[in-house]
């Protein structure tokens, strides 16, 4: 697996295993998940002692260590396209087995600030100093590394496996050895806590083979939060050693009788249990039996306890612990109800607020108010909702529907409205005709009229051209349909006169763009339509949005 | 000072493909990430992708179809961004930017922008 | 993807006038990750007002901003006539990063 020598720390209801080998994080962390585990948490100064009791461990026996500041990871890491978050005791980090974010750190230095890269965290050792409970391996956060190059100074990675609960070690009346197994596979004679569903080999006797006895237990739970081995007296004990040899294995008192026999006795408060040699506070809550917030209530006489919740929660089905209560089972709220820890709160579907008569009620949200209309134009409220309209010459448009958006009506379904020039404004259109003609008192026709070398008549004059109230431009447009951007003049469009073979449009128009900008505009002459052209008129690139500009490569001008 | 320095203009024909540098002088290359925005007249401010020097790691604007490329040579602190199969839509003005040393991506530092013209 | 729009499209505003430029996100965007910039003619964009209501460095007190949720609104208390520009608003919260369509402050 690429991970090597590892070591082992139990303590309250979980285990740390420290692992040598140079590996990615994720692959240690694959390493701790194919065992039950995570690679380590570090919630707290407390659980940072025992982490770095683990890593001692390891290094007591690792000697081969390359770097002299070496680094192991633990299960804080953030993910790609999660930003540094410098608000935050964790900075955006979170743990790999989740949780909340928690207020104890131990960064090493100020934190690369970064988003895009899935950053993960190790602990930084110095192996040329002591490690002392009043230095904690400081936090150092870095690339996540990949198989074969796991990072640099990256010597190891730790591991943590949490459990219902733990059985005291075995007690030894006499000479003997306890092997444990774990069941995150690791096997230890030495282990101050010992989780739950972990075996116990015990073998008696000082070495000499023909006298070996060989014991096996399993730790398991007795009753709820009782873990025990089924084990009763002390084990291996010999009338050579009484109660010399490690007090009899007994917790507290040890009685010899003359026999050389020996019992387990406790002292006043205490009482001894069904093992023979455990004693434990005849106070039953001294023992901490409610958890979850629950507090221990001592039954008459002190014989017996019950458990209490907090407002907000209840005792679940082993009496002992606190778990929320669903106040939204109830349908307290008129729409949407979230449950919280110890309560609840109302929320309102999108289109509502909250308001009205009684708690938890909402109101419709009147998005047509006037400062909050979403709408470029006309504005309906619904129940929950609204619709937006246009004006007439405009159409609706947008992703969201809200905008509005000029009709091109020179390019509209029924061909063009006028016999030669047509001149698209906003909300509206005019007619026009070439040089040498006139446009009829209809608007739509055109007539001989007196030779002239001008314009082709007819682009709308300023005060026509004017934009329908609240109508909107297309985004980072210029809002004039027939004028350049500032400082650019007027141009004239140029025209051929159009045969019915013609496939090319009569007029072309620059793209006229200011680059860089505040606002980038863009800039249209019109469009010039003839009865007889046989193919539709192109719009020139960079035209209103409203237009689908036909480009070079086939597509059409809009994303 | 940080200072974002691009390559020149550029004028492309339909189809092909553009490169446009991004120099990064002031700071130490790797510290901070690089991203790319486009502003056309039509659609605004883009934002394209970015990428992490350091990890070579990056993050793109999927609108993008697998058309833009970003990379960097912490040789030279330089950031490329190349675009292909280029059409008339793609004419805009191409920026450099980075956050520096804010956070939350609020883009501190941009180049001069560098105008590209797709024309056939 | 989140969309960013901004309202009006154009401000005409007197100089020493107030002006109030909105944003509004499609979905609720954390006020850490939303930020305002300030484009001229002919410029790149410039750095403004970064997580909702912090003025970049060297903005004039004259500019605020504020807002959560979907809402995001950019004050200028006094218009000088160096103000009248481009502004954009601009959101993070999950790629891609996305614009608004900017408001265009000019002289009234």
């Known amino acids: 697996t690429g991970a090597d020598t590892e070591a082992v720390v139990c303590v309250g209801t979980a285990c740390y295993t420290a692992h040598s080998g140079k590996l990615s994080a994720a692959e240690a962390q694959n390493h701790c998940n194919q065992n039950g585990g995570n690679l380590a948490t570090v919630k707290s100064k407390e659980e940072a002692q025992h982490v770095q009791r683990v890593l001692a461990q390891l290094l007591r026996r690792e000697a081969a260590l390359t770097a002299r500041m070496s680094k192991f990871w633990i299960g804080l890491q953030r993910e790609k396209g999660k930003c540094l978050d410098p608000s935050l005791p964790l900075k955006g980090f979170s743990w790999v087995g989740g949780g909340e974010d928690t207020p104890y750190s131990n960064w090493h230095k100020e934190l690369r600030n970064s988003c895009i890269s899935k950053r993960c965290v190790s602990l930084l050792l110095d192996l040329s100093q002591p490690l002392l409970p009043s230095r904690l391996p400081k936090w150092s956060e870095g690339p996540c590394g990949s198989p074969g190059s796991p990072g640099s100074n990256i010597e190891g990675f730790v591991c943590k496996f949490s459990f219902k609960g733990m059985c005291r070690p075995l007690a030894l009346g006499g000479p003997g050895q306890v092997t444990y197994t774990t069941p995150f596979q690791t096997t230890s004679s030495s282990l101050e806590a010992v989780p739950f569903a972990s075996a116990a080999n015990v073998a008696c006797g000082e070495g000499d083979k023909d006298e070996t006895q060989s014991h096996y237990f399993l730790c398991k739970e007795k009753a709820p939060d009782v873990f025990d081995w089924g084990s009763s007296g002390p084990l291996c004990v010999s009338p050579k050693y009484g109660c010399n040899f490690n007090n009899g294995g007994c917790h507290q008192d040890c009685f010899e009788g003359g026999d050389g026999s020996f019992l387990c006795g406790c002292r006043p408060g205490f009482r001894l249990l069904d093992d023979l040699v455990t004693c434990a506070s005849r106070n039953p809550c001294s023992s901490s039996p409610c958890r979850g917030g629950a507090t221990c209530v001592l039954g008459p006489h002190g014989k017996n306890y019950t458990c209490r919740c907090p407002q907000g929660y209840q005792l679940d089905s082993s009496q002992l612990d606190c778990v929320d209560v669903d106040e939204c089972q109830d349908s307290p709220c008129a729409q949407e109800c979230v449950n919280t820890p110890g309560g609840f709160r109302c929320e309102c579907w999108v289109g509502y607020e909250p308001g009205g008569p009684g708690e938890g009620a909402c109101q419709d949200v009147d998005e047509c108010a006037l400062g909050r209309s979403p709408c470029a134009q006309g504005c309906t409220n619904t129940d929950g909702s609204f619709h937006c309209s246009c004006e007439e010459g405009y159409v609706l448009a947008g992703e969201d529907g809200t905008q509005c958006q000029d009709v091109d009506e020179c390019v509209g379904p029924g061909g063009p409205l006028c016999d030669s020039l047509c001149f698209n404004t906003q909300g509206s259109f005019h007619c026009g005709c070439l040089p040498g003609w006139v446009l009829a008192p209809n608007g739509v026709s055109c007539t001989m009229g007196p030779v002239s070398l001008g314009p082709p008549s007819g682009p709308p004059d300023e005060e026509d051209k004017g934009e329908k109230e609240g109508s909107t431009v297309p985004r980072a447009a210029t809002a004039s349909p027939t004028r350049g951007p500032e400082g650019t003049p007027k141009a004239t469009p140029t025209t051929s006169r159009p045969s019915l073979s013609s496939d090319a449009p009569i007029t072309s128009a620059p793209l006229k763009m200011l680059a860089p900008s505040g606002s980038p505009g863009v800039w249209r002459e019109p469009s010039i339509h003839h009865a007889t052209a046989a193919s539709g008129p192109q719009e020139p690139a960079g035209g209103d949005s409203s237009v689908a500009t036909q480009n070079n490569d086939g597509t059409d001008g809009q994303k | 000072q940080v200072q974002l320095q691009q390559s020149g203009a550029e004028v492309k024909k339909p189809g092909s493909s553009v490169k446009v540098s991004c120099k990064a002088s002031?700071?130490?290359?790797?510290?901070?990430?690089m991203h790319w925005v486009r502003q056309t007249p039509v659609y605004g401010l883009e934002w394209m992708g970015g990428?992490?020097?350091?990890?070579?790691?990056?993050a793109y604007n999927q609108n993008f179809k697998g058309r833009v490329t970003i990379t960097a040579d912490k040789s030279t602190s330089t950031a490329y961004m190349e675009l292909s199969s280029l059409r008339s839509e793609d004419t805009a003005v191409y920026y450099c930017?980075?956050?520096?040393?804010?956070?939350?991506?609020?883009?501190?530092?941009w180049g001069q922008g560098t105008t590209v013209t797709v024309s056939s | 993807e989140i969309v960013m729009t901004q309202s009006p499209a154009t401000l005409s505003v007197s100089p020493g006038e107030r002006a109030t430029l909105s944003c509004r996100a499609s979905?609720?965007?954390?006020?850490?990750?939303l930020h305002w910039y300030q484009q001229k003619s002919g410029a790149s964009p410039r750095l403004w007002i970064y997580?909702?209501?912090n003025l970049a460095f060297g903005i004039p007190a004259r500019f605020s901003g504020s807002g959560s949720g979907t809402e995001y609104t950019l004050t200028i208390s006094s218009l000088q006539s160096e103000d009248f520009a481009a502004y954009y608003c601009?959101?993070?919260?999950?790629?891609?990063?996305?614009f608004g369509g900017g408001t265009k402050v000019e002289i009234k």
């Open positions: 002031g700071y130490t290359f790797t510290d901070y990430e």
């Open positions: 601009q959101q993070y919260s999950g790629y891609p990063l996305t």
């Open positions: 979905s609720s965007v954390s006020s850490s990750y």
């Open positions: 930017t980075n956050y520096g040393n804010l956070y939350y991506y609020a883009m501190d530092y």
């Open positions: 990428i992490d020097p350091e990890t070579g790691d990056t």
């Open positions: 997580s909702t209501s």
